[in-house]
Amino acid sequence: GSVKVLHEPSCFSDYISTSVCQWKMDHPTNCSAELRLSYQLDFMGSENHTCVPENREDSVCVCSMPIDDAVEADVYQLDLWAGQQLLWSGSFQPSKHVKPRTPGNLTVHPNISHTWLLMWTNPYPTENHLHSELTYMVNVSNDNDPEDFKVYNVTYMGPTLRLAASTLKSGASYSARVRAWAQTYNSTWSDWSPSTTWLNYYEPWEQHL
């Protein structure tokens, strides 16, 4: 039968080395066997490159395209093929569709004055445009009480957050995760980092009296 795209490709760039496109077919499809996504930078002399998609779900395909360090002027021509049949054609400008890389190595350390120090790593090297553009959202939640969670926006430069132990329930187990956003690029949020868990052993002052 005829091959059709139900939801056309939606693409995001990490603005350093990879762009990812995802789309949905109108029926379950073996993406790698049946489809190819070709991409070519709109730049004199550029070559046509081919991405072999993988299945994310039965009818959802995803393609990861290794691209060079992105710059604002870059525009790619994208063509989705099923054999010789062109299913979809469009253009993609990485700088206008940024999804930052996930922050890494989230750790929690006891700090002076009954505070916890949450630290993570900026996912971009210092020379990349996004390194100095990221702001973060940290989600802290009680593992045993879904109602007990807090969201912190970290808008300053350093990838750290100081958390007063007194703002959390004593003796409870908490998990934290972090994601990133690049405001000047009007990006989407990155994926959440893996969670890190710790026990909040802060004793309220009442227990000392």
Epitope: L41, M44, G45, S46, E47, I67, D68
Partner: antibody, heavy 125, light 112 residues
């Protein structure tokens, strides 16, 4: 050592055809775009055409579009320029030159970093 | 098409002096930060052209540091310091950003 050797230049009548060749050595030919540049007697340099490394994309100056065809044979490390419907104003020394590295997603640019010795095309009745 | 305009069209300089050639483009040649697609070439009498500078300011392999390129966007300059008799020839700027590639008219450098 990079070498580019052009050949095929000749005296031809207006309306005639000619095929220029440029044999390359000393670098990975298929990885680079190649360019033809010409120079009319006593005049400046004029870009003619460019072909990317795979041969999949070509570009032409308006003055030669529809008359000239650039092509390459990567197995033979050879660049070609097929010139049809030649005119007196096509009289020039034709140079081939190595252009940008095109195997990367964004071509890496080093200018026209190596040139051949040129071959003379004369169009006259 | 991008038009390239060179000034002056001829230049006479004494050995040891500095020669400067200007090149102006009708559109910006800045693709991204640090990437101006502007080259400089030298054609010595009776020879093929040779690359001197690419991307506005990067010296081609084997080119002495007496040759330097500067500028961004639409205005560029080639400077040749401590000019030698061997520097005589015609200097061309060229934009490599978009088709058609275009050259300046050329500047003839004569050593006094």
């Amino acid at each position: 050592e990079v070498q580019l050797v052009e050949s095929g230049g000749d005296l031809v009548k207006p309306g005639g055809s000619l095929r220029l060749s440029c044999v390359a050595s000393g670098f990975t030919f298929r990885d680079y775009a190649m360019t033809w540049v010409r120079q009319a007697p006593g005049k400046g340099l004029q870009w003619v055409s460019l072909i990317n490394g795979s041969g999949g994309k070509t570009y032409y100056a308006d003055a030669v579009k529809g008359r000239f065809t650039i092509s390459r044979d990567n197995a033979k490390n050879t660049l070609y320029l097929q010139m049809n419907s030649l005119r007196a104003e096509d009289t020039a020394v034709y140079y081939c030159a190595v252009d940008r590295l095109t195997k990367t997603v964004r071509p890496q640019y080093y200018g026209l970093w190596s040139w051949g010795q040129g071959t003379l095309v004369t169009v006259s009745s | 098409d991008i038009v390239m305009t060179q000034t002056p069209l001829s230049l006479s300089v004494s050995p040891g002096e500095t020669a400067s050639i200007s090149c102006r483009s009708s559109q910006s040649l800045l693709y991204s930060i640090g990437y101006n697609y502007l080259d400089w070439y030298l054609q010595k009498p009776g020879q093929s052209p040779q690359g001197l500078i690419y991307l506005g300011s990067k010296r081609a392999s084997g080119v002495p540091d007496r040759f330097s390129g500067s500028g961004s966007g639409t205005d560029f300059t080639l400077r040749i310091s401590r000019v030698e008799a061997n520097d005589t020839g015609v200097y061309y700027c060229m934009q490599g950003l978009q088709s058609p590639l275009t050259f300046g008219q050329g500047t003839k450098l004569e050593i006094k």
